[in-house]
């Protein structure tokens, strides 16, 4: 025959445990039933009745199976900087995020508890490491014969355009000028269109090392600002 | 522009500690990222990890997380790798790379080829 | 981690020729992707970094494509020099990782 399904509350076996979702109460010393997420403990089970269960209230929340006596608060309303990816429900606690253009500076068990706009890359600097939810931006500056003239947080620095002759060359922050002969293009025509990531903090404040001022040997990029360090190289 | 030149063979035992040395010159340490890629004999190329020296901040891949440790002297523009519990697969050539604004790995070290032996 | 296969593993081009290498990534990797060449006895060197842009002082034989998951290098009119192994990287997410290397010979 079956063994007997016992109903909470009940006396478990010496070195048993209580089933899921049931929980052994030291008082009553019998194993009683859990609430479920949503719901808190009302009354608490005796040796003759089992836990009484009430919905949590509007701003608290239990996200688990539980035997507490009262829901939790549901956190604060999320700041200016931040989204609200997760509403308060019964169920479950807000979630907010940074906003784009802002990063994570201090994390909490779920969401943000201090976002931080991301750091722009000043002219001569492009994004060596682009920003993600939990980290900022990383600015360095252009290589030789290379170079980036915008202030972004997404931009990397670009080939210099190669000029049959050069009238101006160029730098870290400019793209060198040719004469009037036309140059060739170091791609495709047309910028590279990367998606926009999350974006902007203080600039990058320090000196721009000036490459070589000798006639740029590289290739051109159309003019404009750099393409975007699209993506993000995640934590 | 920008040289990156390592520091010499090394042969190390099993469980031995291995440091790297990778001396930038032409420019700053503190305008590159630095990242360490290993490649095995007749391998492909894996990265280990990568130091911001002008912040101190670290990133490694989680193969090597436990076992690497990137340090960076800015007084002297000299990048190092720590790889430590060595076993004979970690016998490779390590190579440090420099990163600058173009987000790419613009320079590369000349290879430290380290063999792991008994 | 993301996973870069490149193909084919190796690749018997004559010179004057044209090459053409692939790379898939496991995942979308946007265009964060860089093609590097490597000798043998020699360092890596970038010859394309944000899937199409060639950097400064790779000739216009060079060109790279792609976006998303498909990546592809293209060298024009093969020159003897240009005979070699070459990785395909994605820096979209962490690990950083590299494709296995396609080596490309004389045929």
């Known amino acids: 025959l079956p063994a007997q399904v016992a109903f909470t509350p009940y006396a478990p076996e010496p070195g048993s445990t209580c089933r899921l979702r049931e929980y052994y109460d030291q008082t009553a010393q019998m194993c009683c039933s859990k609430c479920s997420p949503g719901q808190h403990a009302k009354v608490f089970c005796t040796k003759t009745s089992d836990t009484v269960c009430d919905s949590c209230e509007d701003s608290t929340y239990t996200q688990l199976w539980n035997w507490v006596p009262e829901c939790l608060s549901c956190g604060s309303r999320c700041s200016s900087d931040q989204v609200e990816t997760q509403a308060c429900t019964r169920e479950q606690n807000r979630i907010c995020t940074c906003r784009p253009g802002w990063y994570c500076a201090l994390s909490k068990q779920e969401g943000c508890r201090l976002c931080a706009p991301l750091r722009k890359c000043r002219p001569g600097f492009g994004v060596a490491r682009p920003g993600t939810e939990t980290s900022d931006v990383v600015c360095k500056p252009c290589a030789p014969g290379t170079f980036s003239n915008t202030t972004s947080s997404t931009d990397i620095c670009r080939p210099h355009q190669i000029c049959n002759v050069v009238a101006i060359p160029g730098n870290a922050s400019m793209d060198a000028v040719c004469t009037s002969t036309s140059p060739t293009r170091s791609m495709a025509p047309g910028a590279v269109h990367l998606p926009q990531p999350v974006s902007t903090r203080s600039q990058h404040t320090q000196p721009t090392p000036e490459p070589s001022t000798a006639p740029s040997t590289s290739f051109l990029l159309p003019m404009g600002p750099s393409p975007p360090a699209e993506g993000s190289t995640g934590d | 522009e920008v040289q990156l030149v390592q520091s010499g063979a090394e042969v190390k035992k099993p469980g031995a500690t291995v440091k790297i040395s990778c001396k930038v010159s032409?420019?700053?340490?503190?305008?590159?990222?630095l990242h360490w890629v290993q490649q095995a004999p007749g391998k492909g190329l894996e990265w280990m990890g990568w130091i911001d020296p002008e912040e101190g901040k670290t990133k490694y891949g989680q193969k090597f997380q436990s076992r690497v440790t990137i340090t960076a002297d800015t007084s002297t523009d000299t990048a190092y790798m720590e790889l430590s519990s060595l076993r004979s697969e970690d016998t490779a050539v390590y190579y440090c790379?420099?990163?600058?604004?173009?987000?790419?790995?613009?320079?590369w070290g000349q290879g430290t080829l380290v063999t792991v032996s008994s | 981690d993301i996973v870069m296969t490149q193909s084919p593993a190796t690749l018997s081009v004559s010179p004057g020729e044209r090459a053409t290498l692939s790379c898939k990534a496991s995942?979308?990797?946007?265009?964060?992707v860089d093609w590097y060449q490597q000798k043998p006895g020699q360092s890596p060197r970038v010859l394309i970094y944000k899937a199409s842009i060639r950097y400064t002082g790779i000739p216009a034989r060079f060109s790279g494509s792609g976006s998303g998951t498909e990546f592809t290098l293209t060298i024009s009119i093969l020159q003897s020099e240009d005979f070699a192994v070459y990785f395909c990287m994605q820096s979209k997410s962490y690990p950083i990782t590299f494709g296995q290397g396609t080596k490309l010979e004389i045929k």
């Open positions: 032409g420019y700053s340490i503190t305008d590159y990222l």
């Open positions: 790379a420099a990163q600058s604004g173009t987000g790419t790995m613009d320079a």
């Open positions: 995942q979308n990797v946007g265009s964060n």
